[in-house]
Amino acid sequence: CKAMHVAQPAVVLASSRGIASFVCEYASPGKATEVRVTVLRQADSQVTEVCAATYMMGNELTFLDDSICTGTSSGNQVNLTIQGLRAMDTGLYICKVELMYPPPYYLGIGNGTQIYVIDPEPCPDSDF
């Protein structure tokens, strides 16, 4: 296993609709054809997997149908979008990139993006 540098923004504020997007960029040492991207959430010293996708270079990222993540890739950059976020989902979102094929296997873990989420104000009752 060889180390690889992964860069991501330090802080992102989610939209009022609970959507946060950020780019995860990795310094690919070679010509990988198969890449796996995993988003981990660290909060209160606990790390949980948010979503993961394996893709072939040049193709779209495919997350599971029930995933809260979507993404696109361009060269050594992956643009990740996490949807359906609530205030309780505030935390450090870490991008993990694995170059699966061809060998050698490379692993890179970013420093994390602190995503802040605020629950939207409830709409005032109306008479309609």
Partner: antibody, heavy 117, light 108 residues
């Protein structure tokens, strides 16, 4: 080195608007947020809100909602805070600070805004 | 919003003495998101401690932070003349971020 440099002191009349700038250097501007904190004479620190330089999303203090607007210009690595309908109790020193998640680690030198008729 | 309270409001001590400042949150705050700042008259605040216990760059070892949940403490082991200032705690665990009202450490 990492620094934030703010615009100069302002004297405004009640009802007017003020726009304070904060120019960042020495780091990747879009990787962090910029918070705006004010301090009235002899008082503590009050967070007015902050902006994510990465995407422009903002979070304002409830008491200032509708009067404050925070923006960024990523081409010049500059953040702006505009406060409208100024009142005498808006007289304060206004600071910008870098938001990183786990403390505001870099602060501007402060901009004194005086509201007086 | 999370309300931060600090005690005492003023602490009168002599150089060389130990200072213990308290900060309490109205609800539990992850220690990763609790910071302490120092502010001297006419100056911008300066980050002292983040993550409840990690000293910021260039901060002397006499400053230390501790605590978890709702109760946090800033300790200055031996006060130096330049340490007399106002100290603020702040949480950025939940939006909106909030500051405590400050503790003034002055010379006895």
């Amino acid at each position: 080195q990492v620094q934030l440099v703010q615009s100069g002191a302002e004297v405004k009349k009640p009802g007017a608007s003020v726009k304070v700038s904060c120019k960042a250097s020495g780091y990747t501007f879009t990787s962090y947020g910029i918070g705006w904190v004010r301090q009235a004479p002899g008082q503590g620190l009050e967070l007015m809100g902050w902006i994510s330089a990465y995407n422009g999303n903002t979070n304002y203090a409830q008491k200032l909602q509708g009067r404050v607007t925070m923006t960024t210009d990523t081409s010049t690595n500059t953040a702006y805070m505009e406060l409208r309908s100024l009142r005498s109790d808006d007289t304060a020193v206004y600071y910008c600070a870098r938001v990183r998640g786990g403390g505001m680690d870099v602060w501007g030198q402060g901009t004194t805004v005086t509201v007086s008729s | 919003e999370i309300v931060m309270t600090q005690s005492p409001a003023t602490l009168s001590l002599s150089p060389g003495e130990r200072a213990t400042l308290s900060c309490r949150a109205s609800q539990s705050v992850s220690s990763s998101y609790l910071s302490w700042y120092q502010q001297k008259p006419g100056q911008a605040p300066r980050l002292l401690i983040y993550g409840a216990s990690t000293r910021a760059t260039g901060i002397p070892a006499r400053f230390s932070g501790s605590g978890s949940g709702t109760d946090f403490t800033l300790t200055i082991s031996s006060l130096q003349p330049e340490d007399f200032a106002v100290y603020y705690c702040q949480q950025d665990y939940n939006l909106p971020f909030t500051f405590g009202p400050g503790t003034k450490v002055d010379i006895k």
